[in-house]
């Protein structure tokens, strides 16, 4: 029961996390104009991974996509890649984990297969969460660097009477959504890995010993296994979990999504 709850909770937490990663990736407010000395501004700038926007005090908002690919900073491209990898891995992980859920019956899938799939999805969620956290952190670092550079530029003399307004950018809402979502996905992944251990209890492999009693044909097995009638019908303990050494068709047959990254 606890295993099912852990697995189910891990799935739900990861689902919320991945939804958050997708939301953060699509959001326009990765960086927002710093209102350090003017809390009410007539023109407010904010930027996302895919477009930059300007909101005027008139209520008019204009967004422009980054239509160039080569002209964009390498760091931005890296952040995009990390977020997309995170989403793709998370999506595959969700797909795998649905089939791995203990509460869902699919044909005659053995617990060992479910354990394998639970572990696979858990690892995918962990990597997905780490990708999101890394992506958001790289962007945040880029913002901090640019912030202090623009601050330095603001206080260096222009030489003339004319002042130039330097727009500084600070952390946008998407960064916090991304950090939280990445963390949730990571936690969900860890929970799936914990659940996987519960799905595959460690067993001692003893050779079954048959005791022949007169008039009865009963095979006694150590380890609390049920006795089964008949000679040699179930004389070997089945391995429930083999530490992921098997190549399960269910796991391996998913199409590779790395072409999209």
């Amino acid at each position: 029961m606890a295993v099912t709850a852990c697995q189910g909770l891990g799935f739900v937490v990861s689902l919320i996390g991945i939804a958050g990663i997708i939301a953060a990736t699509c959001m326009d407010q990765w960086s927002t104009q710093d209102l350090y000395n003017n809390p009410v501004t007539a023109v407010f700038n904010y930027q996302g991974l895919w477009r930059s926007c300007v909101r005027e005090s008139s209520g008019f908002t204009e967004c422009r996509g980054y239509f160039t690919l080569l002209g964009l900073p390498a760091m931005l491209q890296a952040v995009r890649a990390l977020m997309i990898v995170g989403i793709v891995l998370g999506a595959i992980g969700l797909l795998v984990s649905i089939f791995a859920l203990k509460c869902i019956r699919i044909g005659s899938m053995e617990d060992s297969a479910k354990a394998n799939m639970t572990l696979t999805s858990g690892i995918m969620f962990i990597v997905s969460g780490l990708c999101a956290i890394a992506g958001v952190s790289v962007f945040a670092n880029m913002l901090v660097t640019n912030f202090w550079m623009s601050t330095a530029n603001m206080y260096t003399g222009m030489g003339g009477m004319v002042q130039t307004v330097q727009t500084r950018y600070t952390f946008g809402a998407a960064l916090f959504v991304g950090w939280v979502a990445g963390g949730l996905t990571l936690i969900g992944g860890v929970m799936m890995c914990i659940a996987c251990r519960g799905l595959a209890p460690e067993e001692t492999n003893y050779k079954a010993v048959s005791y022949h009693a007169s008039g009865h044909s009963v095979a006694y097995k150590p380890g609390g296994f049920k006795a089964s009638t008949g000679f040699g019908s179930n004389t070997k303990n089945k391995k429930i979990y083999d530490g992921g050494a098997r190549t399960e068709d269910e796991v391996q047959s998913y199409p590779s999504k790395h072409d999209y990254v």
């Epitope: 005090s57 008139s58 002042q163």
Partner: antibody, heavy 115, light 113 residues
Framework: EVQLVESGGGLVQPGGSLRLSCAVS?????MNWVRQAPGKGLEWVAW????????TYADDFKGRFTISRDDSKNTLYLQMNSLRAEDTAVYYC???????????WGQGTLVTVSS | DIQMTQSPSSLSASVGDRVTITCKSS????????????LTWYQQKPGKAPKLLIY???TLESGVPSRFSGSGSGTDYTLTISSLQPEDFATYYC?????????FGQGTKVEIK
Amino acid sequence: EVQLVESGGGLVQPGGSLRLSCAVSGYTFSMNWVRQAPGKGLEWVAWINMYTGEPTYADDFKGRFTISRDDSKNTLYLQMNSLRAEDTAVYYCARLVRGNGMDYWGQGTLVTVSS
Amino acid sequence: DIQMTQSPSSLSASVGDRVTITCKSSQSLLNSGNQKSYLTWYQQKPGKAPKLLIYWASTLESGVPSRFSGSGSGTDYTLTISSLQPEDFATYYCQNAYSFPFTFGQGTKVEIK
């Protein structure tokens, strides 16, 4: 079609108060009050976001003037306190549009501060 | 606050003349986010409310004749009337629309010569 109609202007003594109204019909996201002293240029007074009620003022009017709106009546207000002779002007309400330009203006209401 | 300085303060011209009014701001009105200059031009006739002519320094408001044009970037802006018409005799104002408080130029009065 947007229409802006101001009212509430008149003669007031120095130190007195007055509340100007601007009846708004049609879509407005944000509004301004702009004034013009006789024979002088335009002077921006205040701005308000008609949805959130967030205001901002020119430095000369902070503390003395209050811009507000009444959603139910679709009306914009300018509460003017501690009036001075130099506040004598025609007061206009104007709608802010794309590019932060003011496209629709009221007909203006004259406020005269004199003893 | 951003100061707006218009020149000339008044000018005399004849119908059909090309008229140029300049406006200088104490700070750049160019927004880096969309590369647009937040400068607005208005026309005002005596006893009437101002009329919006141009926003974003060069975008003509709908219904405004094409003889009006705006140009400039950063701190220097120009309003040009290519062929002055009798109805164009009025006072013209430029406005900082980039940051609060919004500020207007002192105005340029265009009179009949």
